[in-house]
Amino acid sequence: ELCDDDPPEIPHATFKAMAYKEGTMLNCECKRGFRRIKSGSLYMLCTGNSSHSSWDNQCQCTSSATRNTTKQVTPQPEEQKERKTTEMQSPMQPVDQASLPGHCREPPPWENEATERIYHFVVGQMVYYQCVQGYRALHRGPAESVCKMTHGKTRWTQPQLICTGEMETSQFPGEEKPQASPEGRPESETSCLVTTTDFQIQTEMAATMETSIFTTEYQ
């Protein structure tokens, strides 16, 4: 089931999927001055069985100026497309979902593809958010959104992220130096909170980075 909407927009943040669920479609978009070849695929589709998932179809772009070009470019697996995202502000990185069954990795680029990729996500897809350059996350840890089906309608859960501009990092006289953030994953504790928002404490479960003890309760 395709998700009706795009993932939520968070001010000063971008999102990225670590892997794509089977059924995800990626539009075959070409950059300006190029178009899809005749009889070329409209989209790539993540398909597979219980043991292996991969992208069906190949996106191919050709120059709009030359109608009868014979050049048809196929994706080059050794290349990795550079996404328009910055490094995570948090010291933690989400788990590599691509190793999960039923998920495809980021498709390799094709020649003359558009600068932005347009995905059509399916229920169960998870995306991770990060603050854009010049902004920092108020809380530590992964901020994610999942497309869920509720009462016959799809919706994305609200990511737990606030990105603040770095305008007042200087300290007042006599103020102690800030502590360095501990590396790695924060330990989870046995009790849980009973509230959740983007104004949020997100106590994480040791077993997974995909949910927290109490975000699961509401989302």
Partner: antibody, heavy 114, light 111 residues
Framework: EVQLLESGGGLVQPGGSLRLSCAAS????????MHWVRQAPGKGLEWVSV????????YYADSVKGRFTISRDNSKNTLYLQMNSLRAEDTAVYYC???????WGQGTLVTVSS | QSVLTQPPSASGTPGQRVTISCTGS?????????VHWYQQLPGTAPKLLIY???ERPSGVPDRFSGSKSGTSASLAISGLRSEDEADYYC???????????FGGGTKLTVL
């Protein structure tokens, strides 16, 4: 169970200082931004200050900027608010809040009066 | 003066539906930040009632609902009960202040 316990409030003269503390338990304190929010008697909620999870940056409401200092000690799971040059209008219940802010302590009363 | 604007008071009789509005600006609600609602009973700390515009924490009855559009949001309480008598505050992050901003609060009276 998540707990935020404020302390350090009391009666102080104008121009004086106080240091509030907030002891946190029941969650991974070092992973979350923390706030101080205050409420003057019979008035609404007013945000005072925020500190990021690692203490690397801080923001203040204009009304307290230059007088109040927020800090945290992640090894002690404690949040602080150093209040200097106190004024009568700083009289309020001061809440420590976790996140931004979704979980609150019960508050500590600060009274600035001569 | 509060950054978010709420009516100072609202009232209704048991069983009625009451709506409380919250108006912000392009630096908070209008910037895409979520709106949250708190209930504060006399002498107690605020309690989260609605988060992320329209989500309810567990334990909050479905009589409480929220919505957001543009630079405004609203809290609706249906099937009003006497225990709903309290102060209600809206809040949202403000990108200009780099902190949360609150409404002035609405005192709800159940007649």
């Amino acid at each position: 169970e998540v707990q935020l316990l404020e302390s350090g409030g009391g009666l102080v003269q104008p121009g004086g200082s106080l240091r509030l503390s907030c002891a946190a338990s029941g969650f991974t304190f070092s992973s979350y931004g923390m706030h101080w929010v205050r409420q003057a008697p019979g008035k609404g909620l007013e945000w005072v200050s925020v500190i990021s999870y690692d203490g690397s940056y801080k923001y203040y409401a204009d009304s307290v900027k230059g007088r109040f200092t927020i800090s945290r000690d992640n090894s002690k799971n404690t949040l602080y608010l150093q209040m200097n040059s106190l004024r009568a209008e700083d009289t309020a219940v001061y809440y420590c809040a976790a996140g931004v802010p979704d979980y609150w302590g019960q508050g500590t009363l600060v009274t600035v009066s001569s | 003066q509060s950054v978010l604007t709420q009516p100072p008071s609202a009232s209704g009789t048991p069983g009625q539906r009451v709506t409380i509005s919250c108006t912000g600006s392009s630096s908070n609600i209008g910037a895409g930040y979520d709106v949250h609602w708190y209930q504060q009973l006399p002498g107690t700390a605020p309690k989260l009632l609605i988060y992320s515009n329209n989500e309810r924490p567990s334990g909050v009855p479905d009589r409480f609902s929220g919505s957001k559009s543009g630079t405004s949001a609203s809290l609706a309480i249906s099937g009003l009960r006497s225990e709903d008598e309290a102060d209600y505050y809206c809040a949202a992050w403000d990108g200009s202040l780099n902190g949360p901003v609150f409404g002035g609060g609405t005192k709800l009276t159940v007649l």
